[in-house]
């Protein structure tokens, strides 16, 4: 057959769906690869063709759209399963073509099983709630397009293995779950089960997300540099190793980039002709406040290096701060006191440091 623009296997879209539940999968061509939508393509006389390769097989085969109760169907640019079966797992291809044009992309579809605590291999989205911040809501995700607005589904919410009822601060409100006030104890996996009728049949949609309670913007502060500080002096002799830690606390801020960096004499360490290494470590509190430590290390420091200015800088969405380290050359104690030796003929006193 004639050439076809093949976008290959789009592993960025690793689609996971639950066994025995409806799934609607849009052809990724129109979402991520082509500059026109399905309606435009359809109007231009292009046809969308679906086929698949079963798991652990190489053979591409057409999708059977003649199954009982139209279990698999196509509607515009959407492939529908009503419902899925475990052996629907495989690589699916949608191809858009006419006599002069052809474009196709494949994507993996994994049908997964869940247990009665909603555990499964499914990758879970994370929703962050601010600690003690007032009413916040999570919404049952990815249920749009499954049923018309005239249908009134039932929605049951669970935390882990338990149906949410009589929880002090968590209230189910249809598609939303309201947290009157969020605490660390609200961390966990929350599942909504949406049940709806369609053409005389009943379907479930199960959606699980992870709730993570994080620091509140009410309590957020600019970065705080704990080290270097005014109480510690880095006093070294030439030839010794100089180690200066820069330890910075960052309040949790949604979508904030936290940065820590050193300057030496106002320049980046890379721009200074000395052998500097910088090692960074990051730790998080339970509410995702962050502590970053960058240790500046000069293996064999020179007297020149000990005269330089070492400044730790930190920046977040809340502001920028800087703190200089106090670095000194250690003054060696004299081997003996010259004045005493000369003036009084005293014995030599050796001071070893």
């Amino acid at each position: 057959s004639e050439r076809c623009d093949d976008w290959g296997l789009d592993t960025m879209r690793q689609i996971q769906v639950f066994e025995d539940e409806p799934a609607r999968i849009k052809c990724p061509l129109f979402e991520h690869f082509l500059k026109f939508n399905y309606s435009t393509a359809h109007s231009a006389g292009l046809t969308l063709i679906w086929y698949w390769t079963r798991q652990d097989r190489d053979l591409e085969e057409p999708i059977n759209f003649r199954l009982p109760e139209n279990r698999i169907s196509k509607e515009k640019d959407v492939l529908w399963f009503r419902p899925t079966l475990l052996n629907d797992t495989g690589n699916y291809t949608c191809m858009l073509r006419n006599t002069t044009y052809c474009s196709k992309v494949a994507f993996p579809l994994e049908v997964v099983q869940k247990d009665s605590c909603f555990n499964s291999p499914m990758k879970l989205p994370v929703h962050k709630l601010y600690i003690e911040y007032g009413i916040q809501r999570i919404t049952c995700p990815n249920v749009d397009g499954y049923f018309p607005s005239s249908v009134k589904p039932t929605i049951t919410w669970y935390m882990g293995c338990y149906k949410i009822q009589n929880f002090n601060n968590v209230i189910p409100e249809g598609m939303n779950l309201s947290f009157l006030i969020a605490f660390i104890s609200n961390n966990g996996n929350y599942t909504c089960v949406v049940t709806y009728p369609e053409n005389g049949r009943t379907f479930h949609l199960t959606r699980t997300l992870t709730v993570k309670v994080v620091g509140s913007p009410k309590n957020a502060v600019p970065p705080v540099i704990h080290s270097p500080n005014d109480h510690v002096v880095y006093e070294k002799e030439p030839g010794e190793e100089l180690l200066i830690p820069c330890t910075v606390y960052f309040s949790f801020l949604m979508d904030s980039r936290n940065e820590v960096w050193w300057t030496i004499d106002g320049k980046k360490p890379d721009d200074i002709p000395i052998d500097v290494t910088i090692n960074e470590s990051i730790s998080h509190s339970r509410t995702e406040d962050e502590t970053r430590t960058q240790i500046l290390s000069i293996k064999k420091v020179t007297s020149e290096d000990l005269k330089r200015s070492y400044v730790c800088h930190a920046r977040s969405a809340k502001g920028e701060v800087a703190k200089a380290a106090t670095v000194k050359q250690k003054v060696p104690a004299p081997r003996y006191t010259v004045e005493l030796a000369c003036g009084f003929g005293a014995t030599h006193h050796h001071h070893h440091h």
Partner: antibody, heavy 117, light 107 residues
Framework: EVQLVQSGAEVKKPGSSVKVSCKAS????????IHWVRQAPGQGLEWMGY????????EYNQKFTDRVTITADKSTSTAYMELSSLRSEDTAVYYC??????????WGQGTLVTVSS | AIQMTQSPSSLSASVGDRVTITCKAS??????VSWFQQKPGKSPKLLIY???NRYTGVPSRFSGSGSATDFTLTISSLQPEDFATYHC?????????FGGGTKVEIK
């Protein structure tokens, strides 16, 4: 095809215990909760409690808390309901039912337990 | 526990009649009410969930309505196979509770 098949009828003496089984087939057993509901002769339905086969957790109707134990054996896909200290008013048909998302869509055929001296 | 009061406890009707059964909850249960049909010697069968949604395979002559505390099951045109006992149940909060049942008999 989803099926819940319960054990046969039982006649018990007051003060004794009964253990009713419910064998599930046609679906993945540990994906659904199993509830137990009873119905005294000519009466309505009465919820006794449920078991979550994954966690092993059971929740009971307080009316039965001290007397009922609901368990599940994942290896045989079987749920059990044990009721102790039986009295004549426990004479009833006992049903197991599979639940998901608040839907009691599949029920066992029922087990008649008669408590009589 | 939430009480579910079902009425009437029994009714006589003819084939083709419109039949209405009501259920009243002692507290707000939202839409979390199911209706079941039970024939003598058989286990209950789910008809309606979420107060108004017909379960798979249930004929369209069965409909449910209501919210909060007042719920109704309607059979628009009674058929011979509909003579049975009907139960409402709240699936809102433990312990789940059921009405006393309504027996629909042939007139």
């Amino acid at each position: 095809e989803v099926q819940l098949v319960q054990s046969g009828a039982e006649v018990k003496k007051p003060g004794s215990s009964v253990k009713v089984s419910c064998k599930a087939s046609g679906y993945t057993f540990n994906s659904y909760w199993i509830h137990w509901v009873r119905q005294a002769p000519g009466q309505g339905l009465e919820w006794m409690g449920y078991n979550n086969p994954t966690s092993g957790y059971s929740e009971y109707n307080q009316k039965f808390t001290d007397r009922v134990t609901i368990t599940a054996d994942k290896s045989t896909s079987t749920a059990y309901m044990e009721l102790s200290s039986l009295r004549s008013e426990d004479t009833a048909v006992y049903y197991c039912a599979r639940e998901y998302g608040d839907l009691f869509a599949y029920w066992g055929q029922g087990t008649l337990v008669t408590v009589s001296s | 526990a939430i009480q579910m009061t079902q009425s009437p406890s029994s009714l006589s009707a003819s084939v083709g009649d419109r039949v209405t059964i009501t259920c009243k909850a002692s507290e707000n249960v939202g839409y979390s009410v199911s209706w079941f049909q039970q024939k003598p010697g058989k286990s209950p069968k789910l008809l309606i969930y979420g107060a108004s949604n017909r379960y798979t395979g249930v004929p369209s002559r069965f409909s449910g309505s209501g919210s909060a505390t007042d719920f109704t099951l309607t059979i628009s045109s009674l058929q011979p196979e509909d003579f049975a006992t009907y139960h409402c149940g709240q699936i809102y909060i433990y312990p789940y509770t059921f009405g006393g049942g309504t027996k629909v008999e042939i007139k």
